[in-house]
Amino acid sequence: EVEKTACPSGKKAREIDESLIFYKKWELEACVDAALLATQMDRVNAIPFTYEQLDVLKHKLDELYPQGYPESVIQHLGYLFLKMSPEDIRKWNVTSLETLKALLEVNKGHEMSPQVATLIDRFVKGRGQLDKDTLDTLTAFYPGYLCSLSPEELSSVPPSSIWAVRPQDLDTCDPRQLDVLYPKARLAFQNMNGSEYFVKIQSFLGGAPTEDLKALSQQNVSMDLATFMKLRTDAVLPLTVAEVQKLLGPHVEGLKAEERHRPVRDWILRQRQDDLDTLGLGLQGGIPNGYLVLDLSMQEALS
C-alpha cells in the first residue's frame, strides 16, 4: 500500500505528461488525480513509466473504478493492460472491437496470456455470439485460437480467416475440429494452382475425405509422412496401394517405419499382400491371395 502523503507544493499534476516519470511513487499517488488520469489514459502509453510507477497508476484507477473500468479507459490502457489480472478483467464489459484490437496489439507477438484469454472470453460473452468480425480479429492475432473453439463455434468461421492460419497453429486441433476447418480451407484456397494449393491445404488434411485424397494422388504432391500420419483413418483405408504410392511419391519408403502405427497399420490390413509387395518395402500383414475382404464396419466390430 502506497503511503497517503500530501502532494508537495507546486507538484500537483495538471496533465499527464513526461514530467511524471521523475516523480517518486508516493508523489504520483499524492499528486495525480485519478479522474485526470482516466481522461488522459491515451498519454500513459507514450510515456516510459517504470513498472513500479505503472503499479501506482493502476492502483489509482482501481480506486476510482472499484466495479471495473469503463470502456473509454480500457481502450487506452496500452501497456498498463499487462498489469491487469484476470480477476480485474472479469469486471470489465468490453463491447467494442476497436478496444479488443487495441489490447491484443499490446500482447502481439507473445503467447496468449491468461489476461488475453479472459479478455476474449469476456468480449465474446458480451457480444453473445462469435461473429465473423470478431473471429477475423482473433485469428489475425492468434490463429491458434481456432483450436480452442468447439466444432459448433468453428462453423461460423469465415473461409477468409483461414488465410491467417499457420501450420503450427493447428497442432492442438483434434479431428472433429479439422473436419469443420478442412472444407473452409478447401474453399479459401480453391483458386490456387496445384503445388501452391497443396502447400496451403496440407495442414488441414486431417479433415479431408477419401475422395479428396484420391484427387490429390493424381497431382504429384509428394505428401510427407508426418502429414500422412495425421490423416483420418477412415479416409485412408479405401485408398489403393497405387494411390498411396502416388500420394506420397518419394516419401513412400517411410511407410516401413510407420507400419505398426495408425493409419498405416490399419491401411496395410486392408490391402492385398501382393499389391503391398509391389512397393518393395517388405510391408507385411496384407490380405493373402484368395481371401475375401471384410466390410469395414464388420472388421472394426471384430477387432
Epitope: 521523475f22 498519454r43 510515456i47 516510459p48
Partner: antibody
C-alpha cells in the same frame, strides 16, 4: 507564458571554454527535465544533453561526452552548459528546451563560434 | 548520418496533402514516443506533434502524426504557403541514452 532565454554564446578559439546559461520562467522549473539541442549552420538539429529535475543523472551525446557538462540551479530557475575543449565542429546555435522526451518549448538560441 | 531517416525534401501545391516519413529502429521509435518539430526559416524549432499523434494547443488540425512499429509519419493536409519550413522527427533512444533526431525534411509549397 513559458519563456527560455539563452546567453553566454560568442566567439572562442579551438580548445577554449564557454559557459551557456538558460533562464526559465512561466512554469515550475524544478518539476521538469531540461535539454540542450544545437544546430550547426545549414545543418539539422542535434541533441546535446539532458538533465532530469533533480540532476540525479545526466545524459550526453557521444560527440560531446567528457567535454561538456550540464547542470541546473532550481532555486534560480536556470540551466547551464559548461563547454570545454571546444572544436570547430561545435560551432552552432545552441538552444535550451523544456523536457527530455518531447521538447515543448524552445529558447531563441545563442550562437557559439569556434574559430582561430 | 542521422539515426532516424527522413526524406530530404517534400513538396506540394496549396491545398494538397503532404506526408513525411520517419524511419527508426526498435530501440527508438519502436519503444518510445515520436515528436515532430517545425522550424520556419530563421527561427527556433517549435513542437508540432508529441506522443506520436497529439497536437499542442495552437497547432492547426491540418497537422497529424501517426506511428506504426518502427516508423512514424507526419501529414500536412490543406497545404499552405506558411507551412514552408523544415520538419524534424525525434525520439528518445534508450540504447544510446539520448535523444535522436531525423535529418530533417524541407517542405516546399509550389
Amino acid at each position: 507564458e513559458v519563456q527560455l532565454l539563452e546567453s553566454g554564446g560568442g566567439l572562442v578559439q579551438p580548445g577554449g571554454s564557454l559557459r551557456l546559461s538558460c533562464a526559465a520562467s512561466g512554469f515550475t522549473f524544478s518539476n521538469y527535465a531540461m535539454s540542450w539541442v544545437r544546430q550547426a549552420p545549414g545543418k539539422g538539429l542535434e541533441w546535446v544533453s539532458g538533465i532530469p529535475p533533480d540532476s540525479a543523472s545526466k545524459y550526453y551525446a557521444d560527440s560531446v561526452r567528457g567535454r561538456f557538462t550540464v547542470s541546473r540551479d532550481n532555486s534560480k530557475n536556470t540551466l547551464y552548459l559548461q563547454m570545454n575543449s571546444l572544436r570547430a565542429e561545435d560551432t552552432a546555435v545552441y538552444y535550451c528546451a523544456k523536457n527530455m522526451l518531447s521538447f515543448d518549448y524552445w529558447g531563441q538560441g545563442t550562437l557559439v563560434t569556434v574559430s582561430s | 548520418q542521422s539515426v532516424l531517416t527522413q526524406p530530404p525534401s517534400a513538396s506540394g501545391t496549396p491545398g494538397q496533402r503532404v506526408t513525411i516519413s520517419c524511419t527508426g529502429s526498435s530501440s527508438n521509435i519502436g519503444s518510445n514516443a515520436v515528436s515532430w518539430y517545425q522550424q520556419l526559416p530563421g527561427t527556433a524549432p517549435k513542437l508540432l506533434i508529441y506522443y506520436n499523434s497529439k497536437r499542442p494547443s495552437g497547432v492547426p488540425d491540418r497537422f497529424s502524426g501517426s506511428k506504426s512499429g518502427t516508423s512514424a509519419s507526419l501529414a500536412i493536409s490543406g497545404l499552405r504557403s506558411e507551412d514552408e519550413a523544415d520538419y524534424y522527427c525525434g525520439s528518445w533512444d534508450p540504447s544510446l541514452n539520448g535523444y535522436v533526431f531525423g535529418g530533417g525534411t524541407k517542405v516546399t509549397v509550389l
